[in-house]
Interface confidence: low
């Protein structure tokens, strides 16, 4: 898991004669916004192919009005980063598409008009966790300067964000058996094994063999509720004597407010104060409407024409997410039967079947028993791509070729004596028991417990099991 971040530094007329003076048409003022699209791999892809790694839309920039006779400036840009979260591994090679859009604010019928001003495409190799990469690109008569990077989030590290690491509360040496996750010297791979019995819910450890308690819990294994804890209200580790610790991160740690929002703590939660143009619990929403084309991968946008109205993306088959930005993991439905391996090829699903199975979904069980004989009256049972023999009594082994002692498993209960017989076994029951395996006690009055003894059989008589 992680996030790709793009920072636009400047967008303006490129050098040389014939450069445009203004992005706005003659109809009046306009403002810019940007769309970023990420596609995996380095192949040349059609512009309309899905942004399979994700996409993001910036807020609108400040309104720009052309000043006659003034030198053509770099144009005013939207605030903040463009962020594209990715849930799986960072691919390392990708195509980056940055579109610059113009919103004209003149008196158009039907409200503002949008048009694509410039598009740049870069095919790049980039390791997650590295420094910002800077770039300058020309698109027609325009020049775009930007920086980008991919960084891991949550507990993921590594160039592909695939290794999980445990953040340490303070930079220090890792405990025995742990080594730092380069280049972050204050993180250690693999959580240590805590003291045996340490509460999973209320305890944790930073070194193997220890057990430290969260607020409200105490005791060597953090299983005792602390009615009056001396460290209540404190933030961070307390002394070892109190045996308690307020969970370190506060609600604003790591700043949950996106797009430059500022965070303030409220009881048990947080509140974001958002910059102009952003709102939502985490300032993650800009005033996006259907006119911005927020639905990716061919999604149909439904919503009001007025700029403040909400929108909904109706996604085509194979895509999901509020902006149809996520490809449906069709393999998660486990369509391949009988242990087949599922491969999502994009255009189709493919099942790679285990030996002994076939069909588009591995639904056909090949005849495992063809040409396989089970000896001594055994019957062949298909399953799992290999044949298995169900042997007649007195025989065992893979092909029922070995003689088996039916009494070896001591099948007669309650001290009954077992006799091997040509067609199976016979149990001679101890006094007080009956049944083919001596499993039923006999009541003292001579009436047996269920099931009743068959006619002609007295309790205690040997019974042959057929």
């Amino acid at each position: 898991a992680g996030v790709f971040e793009l920072q636009i530094h400047s967008f303006g007329p490129g050098p040389g004669p014939g450069a445009p003076r203004s992005p706005c048409s003659a109809r009046g003022p306009c403002r810019l916004f940007f769309r970023v699209c990420l596609k995996p791999g380095l192949s040349e892809e059609a512009a309309e192919s899905p942004c399979a790694l994700g996409a993001a839309l910036s807020a609108r920039g400040p309104v720009y009005t052309e000043q006659p006779e003034a030198p053509a400036p770099d144009l005013p840009l939207p605030n903040g980063l463009l962020q594209v979260p990715f849930r799986d591994a960072w691919p390392g090679t990708f195509s980056l598409i940055i579109e610059t859009w113009r919103e004209e604010l003149g008196d158009q019928i039907g409200g503002p008009a949008w048009s694509l001003l410039a598009r740049v495409t870069r095919r790049r190799r980039l390791a997650a966790g590295g420094p910002w990469a800077r770039d300058i690109q020309r698109a027609g008569a325009w020049e775009l300067r930007f920086s980008y990077r991919a960084r891991c989030e949550l507990l993921a590290v590594g160039t592909a964000c695939t290794r999980l690491c445990r953040p340490r509360s303070a930079p220090s040496r890792c405990g025995p058996g742990l080594r730092p996750c380069a280049p972050l010297e204050d993180e250690c791979e693999a959580p240590p094994v805590c003291r045996a019995g340490c509460s999973l819910e209320h305890g944790f450890c930073e070194q193997p063999g220890e057990c430290r308690c969260l607020e409200g819990w105490t005791g060597p294994l953090c299983t005792v509720p602390a009615s009056t804890s001396s460290c209540l209200g404190l933030r961070g580790p307390s002394s070892a004597t109190t045996g308690c610790l307020v969970p370190g991160p506060g609600p604003c740690d790591g700043n949950p407010c996106a797009n430059g929002g500022s965070c303030s703590e409220t009881p048990g939660s947080f509140e974001c104060t958002c910059p102009r143009g952003f709102y939502g619990l985490r300032c993650e929403v800009s005033g996006v409407t259907c006119a911005d084309g927020p639905c990716f991968n061919g999604g149909l946008c439904v919503g009001g024409a007025d700029p403040d109205s909400a929108y909904i993306c109706h996604c085509p088959p194979g895509f999901q997410g509020s902006n149809c930005e996520k490809r449906v993991d069709r393999c998660s439905l486990q369509p391949c039967r009988n242990g087949g391996l599922c491969l999502d090829l994009g255009h189709a699903l493919r099942c790679r079947c285990r030996a002994g199975f076939a069909g588009p979904r591995c639904e056909h069980n090949l005849d495992d028993c063809a040409g396989r004989a089970c000896a001594n009256g055994g019957t062949c049972v298909e399953g799992g791509g290999a044949h298995r023999c169900s042997c007649a009594l007195g025989f065992g082994g893979r092909d029922c070729r070995e003689r088996a002692d039916p009494c070896a498993a001591r099948p007669c209960a309650h001290g009954g004596r077992c006799y091997a017989h040509f067609s199976g076994l016979v149990c001679a029951c101890a006094p007080g028991y009956m049944g083919s395996r001596c499993e039923f006690p006999v009541h003292p009055d001579g009436v047996s417990a269920l099931p009743a003894a068959p006619p002609g059989l007295r309790p205690g008589d040997p019974q042959r099991y057929l």
């Epitope: 939660s269 958002c274 709102y279 939502g280 619990l281 985490r282 993650e284 929403v285 996006v288 919503g303 009001g304 403040d308 109205s309 909400a310 929108y311 909904i312 993306c313 999901q320 997410g321 509020s322």
Partner: nanobody, 125 residues
């Protein structure tokens, strides 16, 4: 067509409790803001509580903090409003609203795309 259906309204004495439910049909709950609004006769519609379905983060109007609790069951496409310690001034028609994406700034009730028909709550003293 997306539909929101509220239920659970009724009449109750001051200090009593009610639990409102809102079921969304033909609508998936991912990345959605679900909110409860209320409107008393002759007054403006006001937002009471909101919840973001992805992470369960909530918001409450000052007038109901500590008394009302909003929750959701994504598997059932349902959002609830548990109302305790009801007061006569809580009397209103209560509406459920849905909006894809996160919750907008307070007061932006026009940004909710879908609305239920409402359920009446009457609190007598």
């Amino acid at each position: 067509e997306v539909q929101l259906a509220e239920s659970g309204g009724g009449s109750v004495q001051a200090g009593g409790s009610l639990r409102l439910s809102c079921v969304a049909s033909r609508y998936t709950f991912s990345s959605t803001c679900m909110a409860w609004f209320r409107q008393a006769p002759g007054k403006e519609r006001e937002e009471v509580a909101a919840i973001y379905t992805d992470d369960g983060s909530t918001w409450y109007a000052d007038s109901v903090k500590g008394r009302f609790t909003i929750s959701r069951d994504n598997a059932k496409n349902t959002v609830y409003l548990q109302m305790n310690s009801l007061k006569p001034e809580d009397t209103a028609m209560y509406y459920c609203a849905a909006r894809r994406w996160a919750c907008p700034r307070v007061g932006s009730w026009h940004e909710f795309a879908y609305w239920g028909q409402g359920t009446q709550v009457t609190v007598s003293s």
